[in-house]
């Protein structure tokens, strides 16, 4: 079948990187500076993304795929091959339809986008609060109340001794 | 709605220094991208700078090392100062804001107000 196709069509044998060039006999002409073609049989170049303004380069065009871009720093990419440059917001914040906003009491975010999480609720786990959460941080769950009863011990007994050579299951 | 205001324009001669202003009322604008747009005639409307909520600044080539712009969230107003003013430099400058991106497409724009640099 391959064989039959290019028979039929030779532009189907130009690689990527190359165009059918309809002025020169169907000859595989390389794709002109400034413009690519990323699978074979094209009849065209397609030219390159220019990462201009707030877009930078983040990898150049080759005569195979496209350039791709990214942000300038404190901003980052959002849509389709990095269409727009979204604004970064602090750890302890959220972006909304009013800007970078504070979370919520018992709410967190660590990173510098994305959405304010609750905190963990350790009692869920039937366990207690270690340290306290904070805008930037998740709360840490610490043993049980009931470990913590008076009497109890907080130490941690010790593994038992393993045979030299063994390696944990 | 935020409404923006800019003002600080004028006539200087090439070299001279301009501060423009842009204040912001209606609602506070601390988390939002506010930018700097100039459009020239007959040429298409171009970013000139631009500073996140967090501070980080961005600015066009051609005003780096020029111009600088910052932000009073106490006062909700956005600042370009424009030294070593350029006969190029001449255009109408644009105040926009928007919560989230650097788009033509801001959420809120100024009116506008002119720069015109000449000897």
């Known amino acids: 079948f391959e064989r039959t196709r290019s028979l039929q069509d030779p532009c189907s044998n130009c690689p990527a990187g190359t165009f059918c060039d309809n002025n020169r006999n169907q000859i595989c002409s390389p794709c002109p500076p400034n413009s690519f073609s990323s699978a074979g049989g094209q009849r065209t170049c397609d030219i390159c993304r220019q990462c201009k303004g707030v877009f930078r380069t983040r990898k150049e065009c080759s005569s195979t795929s496209n350039a791709e871009c990214d942000c300038t720093p404190g901003f980052h990419c959002l849509g389709a091959g990095c269409s727009m440059c979204e604004q970064d917001c602090k750890q302890g914040q959220e972006l909304t339809k009013k800007g970078c906003k504070d979370c919520c009491f018992g709410t967190f975010n660590d990173q510098k986008r994305g959405i304010c999480r609750p905190w963990t609720n350790c009692s869920l786990d039937g366990k207690s609060v270690l340290v306290n959460g904070t805008k930037e941080r998740d709360v840490v769950c610490g043993p049980s109340p009931a470990d913590l009863s008076p009497g109890a011990s907080s130490v941690t007994p010790p593994a038992p001794a393993r045979e030299p050579g063994h390696s944990p299951q | 709605e935020v409404q923006l205001v800019e003002s600080g324009g004028g006539l200087v001669q090439p070299g001279e220094s301009l501060r423009l202003s842009c204040a912001a009322s209606g609602d506070t604008v601390s988390g939002y991208v506010m930018l700097w747009w100039r459009q020239a005639p007959g040429k298409e409307r171009e970013l000139v700078a631009a500073?996140?909520?967090?501070?980080?600044?961005y600015y066009t080539d051609s005003v780096k090392g020029r111009f600088t712009i910052s932000r009073d969230n106490a006062k909700n107003t956005v600042y370009l100062q424009m030294n070593s003013l350029k006969p190029e430099d001449t255009a109408v400058y644009y105040c926009?804001?928007?919560?989230?991106?650097?788009?033509?497409?801001?959420?809120?724009w100024g009116q506008g107000t002119q720069v015109t640099v000449s000897s």
């Open positions: 926009a804001a928007d919560p989230a991106s650097i788009s033509t497409r801001s959420a809120y």
């Open positions: 500073i996140s909520s967090v501070g980080y600044t």
